[in-house]
């Protein structure tokens, strides 16, 4: 199986009550605007076939996509939470910049691509859904990377 390196985040990143609260508030506000509750982006299909040691690398890909393709285009919305949460998530992304796996990551890219395709297919409502799942992104990053 591919070996992951530098795929770790310090626990302290997730022990800051203020930014944790702001992230969850942002997710709550966006999910109240999400009318497509049948679809879940961060769920079993995303992680299927991915080993424990690869989970953080997968979440790095999801985090980067969320920052670049979802949060930046929607940066004017959901204030004041957005202006605080985006820099926090960007710091986490930066911390994972050296997170790689040695070997084939095609199965991971396939899973992440399905998430990306779902968001793109749903258009703006897909972006809102992704923001509404920032609580799951936060927790999944934590669980996979600490």
């Amino acid at each position: 199986a591919p070996v992951s390196s530098h795929c770790r985040l310090d626990k302290s990143n997730f022990q800051q009550p203020y930014i944790t609260n702001r992230t969850f508030m942002l997710a709550k506000e966006a999910s109240s605007a999400d009318n497509n509750t049948d679809v879940r982006l961060i769920g079993e299909k995303l992680f299927r076939g991915v080993s424990m040691s690869e989970r953080c690398y997968l979440m790095k890909q999801v985090l980067n996509f969320t920052l670049e393709e979802v949060l930046l285009p929607q940066s004017d919305r959901f204030q004041p939470y957005m202006q605080e949460v985006v820099p926090f998530l960007a710091r986490l992304s930066n911390s994972l910049s050296t997170c790689h796996i040695e070997g084939d990551d095609l199965h991971i890219q396939k899973n992440v691509q399905k998430l990306k395709d779902t968001v793109k297919k749903l258009g703006e409502s897909g972006e809102i859904k992704a923001i509404g799942e920032l609580d799951l992104l936060f927790m999944s990053l934590r669980n996979a990377c600490i």
């Epitope: 199986a1 626990k11 997730f14 961060i42 769920g43 079993e44 992680f47 299927r48 076939g49 991915v50 080993s51 424990m52 040691s53 989970r55 609580d135 799951l136 927790m139 999944s140 934590r142 669980n143 996979a144 600490i146």
Partner: antibody, heavy 119, light 112 residues
């Protein structure tokens, strides 16, 4: 339909060994981690260990050294090898699929197989 | 290792009653908590995960809440098929892998 069926339980003497099997159907075993959990008569659930997709294993501290989990994806089967069995190992042993959704959840479970350790 | 304390250990209730079961963790487990239902002689069945997300096929009378150290499972209107034992389960990451998964002691819901 997703199914897990445990087998191999029975009566064994203290100090003896037993190998339990968990045969799965309705899903691709190679895509999931699998866990073993036990339940002593009238007691609660106790995690034994987990085997990851690529075969890495992690055990509860009390199970290390005596219990070994393995898998054979080609046979759609997960195993629990139990050695140096004691009376307190008497329990129903369950296997379950680990569905990671950002957090580990165990679903579904097999029906269990009873192991009785007694002389 | 995290300890999960469920209360009460047993309770008697009638059909139609609102039932609340609590699970207290000895350390912060965020929302990494699941609830399982087990009927006599049967395997456990997943009810709730992420502390409050209903598993597929689970009736909406079941709900979960809480985060950190205090969690609650509520059955809004108890049905005959709900008489069972309920277990909470925590997943803990970043510590030793030998204590990653922990179950509470269980709460038995009996007919009054």
């Amino acid at each position: 339909e997703v199914q897990l069926v445990e087998s191999g339980g029975g009566l064994v003497q203290p100090g003896g060994s037993l190998r339990l099997s968990c045969a799965v159907s309705g899903f691709s075993l190679s895509s999931y981690a699998m866990i073993w959990v036990r339940q002593a008569p009238g007691k609660g659930l106790e995690w034994i260990g987990i085997i990851d997709i690529e075969g890495s294993t992690y055990y509860a501290s009390w199970a290390k050294g005596r219990f070994t989990i393995s898998r054979d994806n080609s046979k759609n089967t997960v195993y629990l090898q139990m050695n140096s069995l004691r009376a307190e190992d008497t329990a129903v042993y369950y296997c379950a699929r680990d569905r990671f959704v950002g957090v580990d959840i165990f679903d579904p479970w097999g029906q269990g197989t009873l192991v009785t350790v007694s002389s | 290792a995290v300890q999960l304390t469920q209360s009460p250990s047993s309770l008697s209730a009638s059909v139609g009653d609102r039932v609340t079961i609590t699970c207290q963790a000895s350390e912060d487990i965020y929302t990494n908590l699941a609830w399982y239902q087990q009927k006599p002689g049967k395997a456990p069945k997943l009810l709730i995960y992420w502390a409050s997300t209903l598993a597929s096929g689970v009736p909406s009378r079941f709900s979960g809440s809480g985060s950190g150290t205090d969690f609650t499972l509520t059955i809004s209107s108890l049905q005959p098929e709900d008489f069972a034992t309920y277990y909470c389960q925590a997943s803990v990451y970043g510590n030793a892998a030998d204590s990653r998964y922990t179950f509470g002691g269980g709460t038995k819901v009996e007919i009054k």
